[in-house]
Every structure is written in structure tokens, then in C-alpha cells.
């Protein structure tokens, strides 16, 4: 039985030309992590292998940066980044969990005086 | 169009080591991973590892690892694998191969490189 | 080490003929599975990864199936340039392992 959930940063909110951490962390199960996809829609942007490393696609390779840990940064941000990211665990016995974050990327004069989602 | 031009074939002796060049030209070098594979006479293929060349960052199959180095010249585009201690069993083609767009498989290879390790 | 099988491990077959591979893998892999065709003294060819996507400029009489433990490559009318060895690999962790491989050559 799948009894782990995935706790993500939620809605959040950068700085076009700034940078971004996506974190996704996997509780309440003593299932061992594999593999963490992350992928923007339907795009694979980079997977972290427990064995193998990282991969990162190379269409994003020169702004996209590995962790920290399981998470993945986001560099050089630009308006079309906003949308919905999701982390996808695959581990054993358990299966694969998955994980949302929805990000907005805001002109910096917005993201400077405007509202900001915040994590607890 | 993306090449992987590898070095030519090499004669060795046991005990030696061998240096297998993979030359990239069509892509930007330091986007793709590139892996080694090897393939005995006859025999099916065997994974030996794979390099970032944007970090030098390498991951290895346990079986090799203490054998094994590859590394990369970002300069020239180049990867390069170096097998020691060689033995009669490591006779085989070995290619260099890029990490495709979507994960650990290899979506181009070189021509191969034949090592030959006879005393 | 993820062990891999594949059956056949050879056949013969007549162009046009419908052929189906299969590989299967000691444990679960998701999709990451990547079919390769292998001529005589040539490298490797990418036909398929992620279980069931074309690589590019694979015709599409190639396809590919499964997820799990249980893989197929099937070839729906075989062509004379499909007389080749085919490798399963996955591609899910380390060490990355090939299947033995599926010689497929003319009746």
C-alpha cells in the first residue's frame, strides 16, 4: 500500500531573469527513492537516478541546474516559465508518487512591490 | 548532422592500459552526457559508464570501476576512455555514445574502436 | 544488477512478414526501456526508448510496448533492411544492461 505523501514549495513566485529552487520531499513512507523526474507539462526538464546521477535535458542545460539534493534550480527565468512543474518519484516497493508546483514568473517591478506566495 | 568519430584500432599487451578517443562534431558538446559501451567478439554489448563533459562529472559500472577513467576535453569536443591492467578478456570494439534528449539510452555511436590484447 | 532476457533468441522470418521480440526484465522499470538494431561490423541504431517512442527517422513499422518487467518490439511487415541483431536495454539505473540480444535473419 502507497502510504507516502509528497510535500512540494506549492505556489510560488520569482523574478524574471532571477533564479528559482524547485523542492519536492517524499514523507511518511520507508520506501527507498530510485528515480525523481522533473518535468514541466508534458517536458522533461532533468531526472536524478539514485545510481546514475543526473540528466538533464539539453534543451535546458545551459539554465538548469541539479538540486539542492533531490530539487532542481532554475536559472536566467523568463515569463513562458510560468506554469505548472511536477516532481516524479518512482521508488520501491511503493511505486511512483507525484508532486505539483505551480510557478509564476513576474516582471521585476511586479515581483518587487506585488504579493508573493510564501512558504511556511 | 551529429558525428562521433572514434580513434583507430589498437594492439596491447596484458598489463596495459589503452586510450580510446570519441571526436564530436554537429551538437554542443557540453549538453549531451556521452557514454562507453563495449562489445566482445560474437557477444552482446556491456555498458562501462558515462560523463558529463559540462562538469567532468562520470558515473561507472562497478565491474570496471576500478579500471576505468573517462574524462573529456572540452576544448577539442573530445571524450576519452582509458581501460587499464587490460587482460585477453577486454579484446572487444568499444563506442562512445551521446545520452539521448529524455534520459540513459544513447541516441548516436561512433563507428567503434577494436582493442586487441594479445602477448 | 538488472538482468535482462530476450526470446527469441533467434528466428527466421520472409519479408513482410510480421515479427514480434520480447525482452524481459528482472525488475521493475517503468518505462525506461530502449530498443537498438545491430548490423554485421556496424554500431548500434537508436529504434526506440521510453518503452514505446520512435527515435527520429525510425520508420514507424517499428513499435514498441510494455512497461513493467514485460517489453515487445514488434516490426509490422519486415523489410530486407531489418535482417539484424536486436538489443533491449533499459535505462533506469546502474549498471545500465543490455539484453542478449535477437538475431533476426532470412528464412
Known amino acids: 500500500m502507497m502510504t507516502g505523501t509528497i510535500e512540494t514549495t506549492g505556489n510560488i513566485s520569482a523574478e524574471k531573469g532571477g533564479s528559482i529552487i524547485l523542492q519536492c520531499h517524499l514523507s511518511s513512507t520507508t520506501a527507498q527513492v530510485t528515480q525523481v523526474n522533473w518535468e514541466q507539462q508534458d517536458q522533461l526538464l532533468a531526472i536524478c537516478n539514485a545510481d546514475l546521477g543526473w540528466h538533464i535535458s539539453p534543451s535546458f542545460k545551459d539554465r538548469v541546474a541539479p538540486g539542492p539534493g533531490l530539487g532542481l534550480t532554475l536559472q536566467s527565468l523568463t515569463v513562458n516559465d510560468t506554469g505548472e512543474y511536477f516532481c516524479i518519484y518512482h521508488t520501491y516497493p511503493d511505486g511512483t508518487y507525484t508532486g505539483r508546483i505551480f510557478l509564476e514568473v513576474l516582471e521585476s517591478s511586479v515581483a518587487e512591490h506585488g504579493a508573493r506566495f510564501q512558504i511556511p | 548532422e551529429v558525428q562521433l568519430v572514434q580513434s583507430g584500432a589498437e594492439v596491447k599487451k596484458p598489463g596495459a592500459s589503452v586510450k580510446v578517443s570519441c571526436k564530436a562534431s554537429?551538437?554542443?558538446?557540453?549538453?549531451?552526457?556521452m557514454h562507453w559501451v563495449r562489445q566482445a567478439p560474437g557477444q552482446g554489448l556491456e555498458w562501462m559508464g558515462r560523463?558529463?563533459?559540462?562538469?567532468?562529472?562520470?558515473k561507472y559500472n562497478e565491474k570496471f570501476k576500478s579500471r576505468v577513467t573517462i574524462t573529456v576535453d572540452k576544448l577539442s569536443s573530445t571524450a576519452y576512455m582509458e581501460l587499464s591492467s587490460l587482460r585477453s578478456e577486454d579484446t572487444a570494439v568499444y563506442y562512445c555514445?551521446?545520452?539521448?534528449?529524455?534520459?540513459?539510452?544513447?541516441?548516436?555511436w561512433g563507428q567503434g574502436t577494436t582493442v586487441t590484447v594479445s602477448s | 544488477d538488472i538482468q535482462m532476457t530476450q526470446s527469441p533468441s533467434s528466428l527466421s522470418a520472409s519479408v513482410g512478414d510480421r515479427v514480434t521480440i520480447t525482452c524481459r526484465v528482472s525488475?521493475?522499470?517503468?518505462?525506461?526501456l530502449a530498443w537498438y538494431q545491430q548490423k554485421p561490423g556496424k554500431s548500434p541504431k537508436l529504434l526506440v526508448y521510453?518503452?514505446?517512442t520512435l527515435a527520429e527517422g525510425v520508420p514507424s513499422r517499428f513499435s514498441g510496448s510494455g512497461s513493467g518487467t514485460d517489453f515487445t518490439l514488434t516490426i509490422s511487415s519486415l523489410q530486407p533492411e531489418d535482417f539484424a541483431t536486436y538489443y533491449c536495454?533499459?535505462?533506469?539505473?546502474?549498471?545500465?544492461?543490455f539484453g542478449p540480444g535477437t538475431k533476426v535473419d532470412i528464412k
Open positions: 555514445a551521446r545520452e539521448g534528449h529524455y534520459g540513459f539510452y544513447s541516441d548516436y
Open positions: 554537429g551538437y554542443t558538446f557540453t549538453n549531451y552526457y
Open positions: 560523463i558529463d563533459p559540462d562538469s567532468g562529472g562520470s
Open positions: 525488475e521493475n522499470i517503468y518505462s525506461y
Open positions: 521510453n518503452a514505446k
Open positions: 536495454q533499459h535505462h533506469y539505473g546502474n549498471p545500465l544492461t
